[in-house]
């Protein structure tokens, strides 16, 4: 569990209501790990942040990210539940003023310092593929997900619904 103080420091408003509303409906801090329990860590190197996928030592502290949940203002196109619920998008921020971004040209996931309103590249549609796992689909490139490739985060194209459970796009969120 975590205290509100850490979350309050990061509370931000998003002013582009056409994307996902004025402000997040919920925010909380969590650590991010892969399906195989490797940790996603963030390190400041040469004035920019690098993202690593690595095994932590036994008592090493996990990095936390602020997950901010936004309701889409547009009804989902999917068949099934339709307007019964608004699709949720998330932004992920490991430190103040930095957000995970999808670089679709380079098929990479990067940390960018940016002004509000946040660009579309910072938003990811949240999926539950597997019991306690989530996946993050690029708002800017449907069918492309954050995944793990060569011990780094990358953008991975998922061609069919059968591949939605592929382990390299599954992540675990933990508050401990």
């Amino acid at each position: 569990a975590f205290g509100i103080s850490g979350v309050q420091k990061y509370t931000r408003a998003l002013h582009d209501s056409s994307i996902t509303g004025i402000s997040p409906i919920t925010e909380y801090l969590a650590s991010l790990s892969t399906y195989n329990d490797q940790s996603i860590t963030f390190a400041l190197e040469d004035e920019s942040y690098e993202i690593y996928v690595e095994d932590l030592k036994k008592d090493e502290k996990k990095d936390k990210v602020l997950l901010s949940y936004y309701e889409s203002q547009h009804p989902s196109n999917e068949s099934g539940d339709g307007v019964d619920g608004k699709m949720l998008m998330v932004t992920l921020s490991p430190t103040k003023d930095f957000w995970l971004h999808a670089n679709n040209k380079e098929h990479s996931v990067e940390l960018h310092k940016c002004e509000k309103p946040l660009p579309d590249q910072a938003f990811f549609v949240l999926h539950n593929m597997h019991s306690n796992c989530v996946s993050f689909e690029c708002k800017t490139d449907p069918g492309v997900f954050i995944g793990v490739k060569d011990n780094h985060l990358a953008l991975i194209k998922v061609d069919s619904s059968e591949n939605l459970c592929t382990e390299n796009i599954l992540f675990k969120l933990s508050e401990t």
């Epitope: 569990a1 975590f2 409906i25 919920t26 909380y28 801090l29 969590a30 949940y69 309701e71 989902s76 999917e78 068949s79 099934g80 539940d81 019964d84 619920g85 608004k86 699709m87 949720l88 549609v125 949240l126 999926h127 539950n128 593929m129 019991s131 306690n132 989530v134 996946s135 939605l164 969120l173 933990s174 508050e175 401990t176």
Partner: nanobody, 121 residues
């Protein structure tokens, strides 16, 4: 479809306590979090408390130390124990859940109809 049904609201004197409940039902595959928001007359809806599937909690500063959120995963139910209630806690309290259903992996936000809490002497 996912339905959220709140209960437990009512009239209480300042300093008193209430316990709100919210039960989720329907074709729920997974629940990412369940939480409570409130909306006082003429004000914007605000987050009160949230509990995640992993057990993490987050509270608004104004209720920290007075309100406690908890969950019962087996019943897909979330509770809000409200103690030391104040007049400024008067509002409609809404349950909110982030969940995916068996018809889609996409996580969606679902809301209850709200339950009125009035704190007055």
């Amino acid at each position: 479809q996912v339905q959220l049904v709140e209960s437990g609201g009512g009239l209480v004197q300042p300093g008193g306590s209430l316990r709100l409940s919210c039960a989720a039902s329907g074709s729920i595959r997974t629940v990412n979090y369940m939480g409570w928001h409130r909306q006082a007359p003429g004000k914007q809806r605000e987050l009160v408390a949230v509990v995640t599937s992993g057990g993490g909690t987050n509270y608004a500063d104004s209720v920290k130390g007075r309100f406690t959120i908890s969950r019962d995963d087996s019943k897909n139910t979330v509770y809000l124990q409200m103690n030391s209630l104040r007049a400024e806690d008067t509002a409609v309290y809404y349950c909110n859940a982030a969940a995916s259903t068996y018809s889609s992996t996409v996580v969606r936000s679902f809301w209850g109809q709200g339950t009125l809490v009035t704190v007055s002497s």
